[in-house]
């Protein structure tokens, strides 16, 4: 008979299955212990209350145990990300138990029905964990639930229902529709495990957000702002004009969370770091590259346990493919203007020269506008490790290369028609590396020539470690 559960009545009543297959579905959730990296190896199905398969399949009671929980499916077959994740976990944690939670019968439904089935699947996982806890040496502390999309909320339910506290839950782009703004007991939340870390890769403030936008863990990481992922634009996924749809873009961005996690498992030597910040815009301005007071963390599997009183939103930039790591730099440029130039929107580029390599020409993204006679902060990032920075080339783009730039030039000219000699003065650039936290100051190569105008460039050489110059008073506002 169905198990009654709490105030909401019988769990079995929550199963939303097409009538045609109602009789077929028993059990609705299977636990497949993946005993090999080889996806063709069928693994072992664990059965609640039956200890023999645990012994036959070599379940290691003292080792870490990963439960991988898939999400909604339109195909009824496991997508390749799951195979990649299983393989990566086996590579990284050779003795670990890797269990795939197969809830395809309940996930291969209308999305709304699959959502309504998440609770019962979470309960099934909790029951399996409760049973395993009865065994000697098995500890919930060693359990790590990894849920993708709808599976992240299933993991939340499992963590909520289990007797005791699961060691860790990782939410890989937890599903947004029907969960955004939901009560904490009806979605993944920080109290579902001792440590809940979340990667958000497909959040949208307009249109349908496939991934949840709100923070739902102890740490919530938003790679590339949590929305547009590099390598997932229409141009990137089309491959050829004959192929590709918006669906592919959605899949690419949503699934990126899984690949970032896989990357953290297999590219241990190239960890990606995220930085705490109140919002994406502040991060884009380069304001948030601090590691003080736990303000930065590795992402994915290597994330350090942080149990904050409130959610910690963290940001980073990534490459378009594995390894995803980039090197973040905060650049503080004090812009002097000796002429009243009105509103000006220069297009600046920098090239960084280091002991290991030189960067490409990198745009300085102006999030709002350049403040004159003030310090402007920018974020730049490189795909390669440049080593110690030696010099910086700053270029003000000259001839307009886009209609937008042409419009900016025209607007600037119309506002200041009698001021053709547009010119800014920059004496030095302060740089902070996000990855090393090292601060450097770069001074204009020619102290007599610190002016820059469209189509011109300035060179800066490292003139000291740290930021404070001689004869300089301490800044009144400390950046985080």
């Amino acid at each position: 008979s169905p198990t009654p559960f709490g105030p909401e009545g019988q769990l079995e009543d929550e199963l939303h299955k097409p009538k045609a297959i109602q009789t077929e579905v028993k059990p609705s959730v299977r636990f497949n212990l993946r005993t090999s990296k080889d996806p063709e190896h069928e693994g072992c199905y664990l059965s609640l209350g039956h200890s023999q398969p645990l012994e036959d399949c070599g379940f290691n009671m003292t080792a870490k145990t990963f439960f991988i929980i898939h999400g909604w499916t339109m195909s009824g077959i496991f997508e390749n990300w799951l195979h990649k994740l299983v393989s990566a976990l086996h590579t990284r944690e050779k003795d670990a138990n890797v269990v795939v939670v197969d809830w395809l019968p309940l996930a291969h439904q209308l999305y709304t029905d699959a959502v309504n089935n998440t609770r019962v699947v979470g309960h099934s996982i909790a029951r399996m964990l409760d049973w395993l806890q009865e065994k000697d040496d098995f500890s919930l502390e060693n359990v790590h639930l990894i849920g993708y999309s709808l599976g992240a909320h299933v993991a939340g339910y499992a963590g909520n229902f289990v007797k005791g506290t699961v060691g860790r839950i990782t939410g890989l782009d937890p599903a947004g529709p029907m969960f955004e703004g939901a009560d904490i007991h009806k979605r993944l939340s920080p109290d579902d495990a001792d440590f809940v870390d979340v990667l958000h890769t497909y959040t949208r403030s307009f249109g349908l957000s496939i991934g949840i936008q709100m923070p739902v863990g102890h740490i919530d990481i938003y790679p590339n702002g949590g929305d547009f992922q590099p390598g997932c634009g229409l141009n990137d996924v089309l491959g050829s004009m004959a192929y590709g749809t918006i669906t592919e873009v959605v899949k690419c961005e949503h699934e990126r969370a899984v690949h970032l996690f896989v990357d953290s498992l297999v590219n241990q030597d190239k960890p990606s770091f995220a930085f705490q910040c109140t919002d994406s815009n502040r991060f884009k301005k380069g304001i948030c590259l601090s590691c003080r007071k736990n303000r930065c963390n590795s992402i994915g599997y290597n994330a350090k346990k942080m149990r904050n009183k409130r959610n910690s939103k963290m940001y980073l930039k990534t490459r378009a493919g594995m390894p995803f790591r980039v090197y973040h730099y905060q650049m503080k440029i004090h812009v002097f203007s000796y002429k009243n130039m009105g509103e000006i929107e220069p297009t600046f580029y920098v090239t960084l020269y280091g002991t290991n390599a030189d960067s490409q020409t990198l745009p300085l993204e102006i999030v709002e506008r350049i403040e004159q006679n003030a310090t402007n902060t920018f974020l730049v990032y490189t795909e390669e490790d440049l080593g110690d920075l030696l010099k910086i080339q700053l270029t003000w783009e000259g001839a307009s290369q886009s209609w937008y730039n042409l419009w900016k030039e025209l607007r600037s000219y119309l506002s200041q028609p009698h001021n053709p000699g547009r010119e800014l003065n920059i004496r030095r650039i302060r740089v902070k590396s996000g990855e090393t936290q090292r601060k450097l100051t770069f001074c204009a190569e020619d102290p007599e020539n610190t002016s820059i105008s469209p189509g011109r460039e300035l060179w800066f050489r490292k003139c000291r470690d740290g930021w404070r110059m001689k004869n300089e008073t301490s800044p009144t506002v400390e950046l985080p």
């Epitope: 609705s28 063709e40 069928e42 195909s75 009824g76 077959i77 390749n80 050829s240």
Partner: antibody, heavy 120, light 107 residues
Framework: EVQLQQSGPELLKPGASVKISCKAS????????IHWVKQSHGKSLEWIGH????????NNNEKFKDKATLTVDKSSSTAYMELRSLTSEDSAIYYC?????????????WGQGTTLTVSS | DIQMTQTTSSLSASLGDRVTISCRAS??????LNWYQQKPDGTVKLLIS???KLHSGVPSRFSGSGSGTDYSLTISNLEREDFATYFC?????????FGSGTNLEIK
């Protein structure tokens, strides 16, 4: 030994329907998926769709959505494909094939094929 | 849908020869490429999965390689039973698609 045994050849008139069977043996039927593939005369192979015998969930190639219906009978470890509103375009060899649980899993064992001829 | 192209529809070779059959995908398929052999009687067998993994029971003279969009199947020392038609198939994205086949004939 894994085996997929398909039903015999069929000769049918346009507009008719046919149900081809594929009996699996030598493995646990619910641990893999069954896929159907069409090969028109002297042509390449076309994936029609698959069924997950564990719960009966199916997914068809858009091209065959209105043509093929896939079912299973777990008690006899048999998969079926029904083709409706037959036309001469449906004349082909139809194969069932076993596949693992991932997209990327290959079709590791194939039935011997069922020849369907549609002619008035 | 991902298009799989086998440019050589027919290939003639002699016993003992080494032959290479190629297959190109219309986009990156992340090494999720499988090769099949179809005998004249219609029997289909899996030879290679995941670009280069030999299926159990398949002779070691068969090998596969490639990445991204370009893949190939090599038969190093042709034997009589190898004369057949060879198909590639991608397992990266639904719907699964096959190449048009390469018929290997005795010279």
């Amino acid at each position: 030994e894994v085996q997929l045994q398909q039903s015999g050849p069929e000769l049918l008139k346009p507009g008719a329907s046919v149900k081809i069977s594929c009996k699996a043996s030598g493995y646990t039927f619910t641990d893999n998926t069954i896929h159907w593939v069409k090969q028109s005369h002297g042509k390449s192979l076309e994936w029609i769709g698959h069924i997950n015998p564990y719960y009966g969930g199916t997914n068809n190639n858009e091209k065959f959505k209105d043509k093929a219906t896939l079912t299973v009978d777990k008690s006899s470890s048999t998969a079926y494909m029904e083709l409706r509103s037959l036309t001469s375009e449906d004349s082909a060899i139809y194969y069932c094939a076993r596949k693992g649980i991932y997209y990327s899993s290959p079709f590791d064992y194939w039935g011997q094929g069922t020849t369907l001829t549609v002619s008035s | 849908d991902i298009q799989m192209t086998q440019t050589t529809s027919s290939l003639s070779a002699s016993l003992g020869d080494r032959v290479t059959i190629s297959c190109r995908a219309s986009q990156d398929i992340n090494n999720y490429l499988n090769w099949y052999q179809q005998k004249p009687d219609g029997t289909v067998k899996l030879l290679i999965s995941y670009t280069s993994k030999l299926h159990s029971g398949v002779p070691s003279r068969f090998s596969g390689s490639g990445s991204g969009t370009d893949y190939s199947l090599t038969i190093s020392n042709l034997e009589r039973e190898d004369f057949a038609t060879y198909f590639c198939q991608q397992g990266n994205t639904l719907p699964f698609t096959f190449g048009s086949g390469t018929n290997l004939e005795i010279k």
